[in-house]
């Protein structure tokens, strides 16, 4: 299969900026490349086909170029409606592989997350499972790392993260990380902690609780 690699995965920009997204194919696809724009909850919209041909109705600020293995999509002057995720797709072969996407986000000022930790509810514990939630509120940029520690032992593979869309007012994100354990495992341990790192924080922030004391 032909692999498609897009970069960057996130692009921070302001209205009026000129932005360029790159797409590389693992082997030559001539000019059999399309670009799509997708907004949350909506179907992808075709912008460009055959690398540089503008789809009807698409503004001329979208410019496609390239051939062989290297392609670019340039937005000459970013407009408010252009904040979205962009995908390249090759259609030289049957697999019609997509790139992994580039999210064009509103460039905000750096904001460190406010961090909160929530133990499982008594109601949930009755069902035999325990979910501990670490909430990161109102941070920018989106890159943040959450590490779970149980009795100071690093946890891996038993947590899931969910990130909100960028807030339209202040350009921040919020994230929840959920550590899921069986009730039996939860009750074997005492100290539950989430450690958060983000570029707005000079040092990691740790929030914790002692089971049975909250």
């Amino acid at each position: 299969d032909i692999q498609m690699t897009q970069s960057p995965s996130t692009l921070s920009a302001s209205v009026g900026d000129r932005v360029t997204i790159t797409c590389r194919a693992s082997q030559s696809i001539n000019t059999w490349l399309a670009w799509y724009q997708q907004k949350p909850g909506k179907a992808p919209k075709l912008l460009m086909y055959k690398a540089s041909s503008l789809e009807s109705g698409v503004p001329s600020r979208f410019i496609g170029s390239g051939s062989g293995t290297e392609f670019t999509l340039t937005i000459s002057s970013l407009q408010p409606d252009d904040f979205a995720t962009y995908y390249c797709q090759q259609y030289n072969s049957d697999s019609k592989m997509f790139g992994q996407g580039t999210k064009v986000e509103v460039k905000g000022t750096v904001a460190a997350p406010s961090v909160f930790i929530f133990p499982p509810s008594d109601e949930q514990l009755k069902s035999g499972t325990a979910s501990v939630v670490c909430l990161l509120n109102n941070f920018y940029p989106r890159e943040a790392k959450v590490q779970w520690k149980v009795d100071n032992a690093l946890q891996s593979g038993n947590s899931q993260e969910s990130v909100t869309e960028q807030d339209s007012k202040d350009s921040t994100y919020s994230l929840s990380s959920t550590l899921t354990l069986s009730k039996a495992d939860y009750e074997k341990h005492k100290v539950y902690a989430c450690e958060v790192t983000h570029q707005g924080l000079s040092s990691p922030v740790t929030k914790s609780f002692n089971r049975g004391e909250c």
């Epitope: 960057p8 995965s9 996130t10 692009l11 921070s12 890159e143 790392k145 000079s202």
Partner: nanobody, 126 residues
């Protein structure tokens, strides 16, 4: 390991300018992001600005970020050939008085500041 050394601090009048430098040595190829923080007496260390030094998968190298206090007045930049980061500070105010620290994250831990300089004092007089 990466070593960071700041320079360029000093005494300046309100409305004036200063350029801080941060010279990196050691495993500089492992730097992902370089940032400036500042700490005024009795206050917490505050983020000022950052620049992506070596692009990972997320942002292009050269992408810049600013804190509220710096936006519009300060400019962060770097010179990879010289392994040096810069913070150009214009329209300085007395409230910008602080010790300014250079910090860096690594490609392995791109959101954690594992490396810090010793700091350089900036004093803005009214």
């Amino acid at each position: 390991q990466v070593q960071l050394q700041e320079s360029g601090g000093g005494l300046v009048q309100a409305g004036g300018s200063l350029r801080l430098s941060c010279a990196a040595s050691g495993r500089t190829s492992s730097i992902h992001l370089m940032a400036w923080f500042r700490q005024a007496p009795g206050k917490e260390r505050e983020f000022v600005a950052s620049i992506i030094w070596t692009g990972g998968t997320t942002y292009y190298a050269g992408t810049t970020f600013y804190g509220d206090s710096a936006e519009g007045r300060f400019t962060i930049s770097n010179d990879n050939a010289r392994n040096t980061g810069y913070l150009q500070m214009n329209s300085l105010k007395p409230e910008d008085t602080a010790v300014y620290y250079c910090a860096a994250t690594s490609l392995e831990n791109p959101t954690r500041y594992d490396y810090w300089g010793q700091g350089t004092q900036v004093t803005v007089s009214s």
